[in-house]
Amino acid sequence: TIPPHVQKSVNNDMIVTDNNGAVKFPQLCKFCDVRFSTCDNQKSCMSNCSITSICEKPQEVCVAVWRKNDENITLETVCHDPKLPYHDFILEDAASPKCIMKEKKKPGETFFMCSCSSDECNDNIIFSEEYNTSNPDLLLVIFQ
């Protein structure tokens, strides 16, 4: 997708729905493209992106991409259509309400990516698999 300052006029009258028949409307996502980041060796990080965009299309989801090489760390935040690959990878977790980072194989760098479908969900990127649970007892163990 494209950030709001260069958005085109679109008028798609089709109502987009999810698998349960719920109406999908344009989502709110953090949208700072690529920025240098200090996020490293943490269970989760905030994006520190102050730009919240209304995604261009109802089917788009929030995406975050974390990359580390010998020189720097960057965090990319965008809206993207999960039917299309991003950085040559399928957005397999697009229906998740939280942005749970998954490592991807990229030569010469450490590369993590997540996608999610709740408003501004790419503001909080989660590296620890412990967060990926709906078990309250487990959460008690994590945070005690």
Partner: antibody
Framework: QVQLVESGGGLVEPGGSLRLSCAAS????????MSWVRQAPGKGLEWVGR??????????DFAAPVKGRFTISRDDSKNTLYLQMNSLKTEDTAVYYC???????WGQGTLVTVSS | DIQMTQSPSSLSASVGDRVTITCRAS??????LNWYQQKPGKAPKLLIY???SLQSGVPSRFSGSGSGTDFTLTISSLQPEDFATYYC?????????FGQGTKVEIK
Amino acid sequence: QVQLVESGGGLVEPGGSLRLSCAASGFTFSNAHMSWVRQAPGKGLEWVGRIKTTYSGGATDFAAPVKGRFTISRDDSKNTLYLQMNSLKTEDTAVYYCTLDLRQYWGQGTLVTVSS
Amino acid sequence: DIQMTQSPSSLSASVGDRVTITCRASQSISSYLNWYQQKPGKAPKLLIYAASSLQSGVPSRFSGSGSGTDFTLTISSLQPEDFATYYCQQSYSTPPTFGQGTKVEIK
């Protein structure tokens, strides 16, 4: 289709309290930031406040005239948004709309009248 | 808070006229601007978001332009159902503030 239905409005004396509800259906409520916007009789639109998704911490923000008096909460299990209004003033008289934050869906509004 | 100023506050026009409403922000808001239409006794309806993106189902005679501090809503050929009040709203920062409204009346 998407529906937002407000309830709980009515006549209340200055200094009193009222709780508005907004029942949401037709979309994944838990995934959406929600807002309240009000409109005094014959006046323009005024943003009241918002609540973010529980996934992003459920943080709330308020307009200066209502800060400290109004609170917003949500019950994702009931697909319901709430606006708790305390220490009401005559200038809070308005139609209150529940809205999907910054987007196209609004409720029909509920009238709150603060008068002695 | 960012102040939004609309002009004119009201205008009279005839069916078929081209109508332009302007909205000025007190500081740069990039393209974070929405336009709403409201008819008496009804909830506002979103017409344009992100300054120029037409909301699904909105007729193409409505268009939005601008960035930074100056924005325009244009109705290329006014129709009977377009007589209403129009509001701009910035979504660049909290609180998201509205303009005072522009009432479009029948001449």
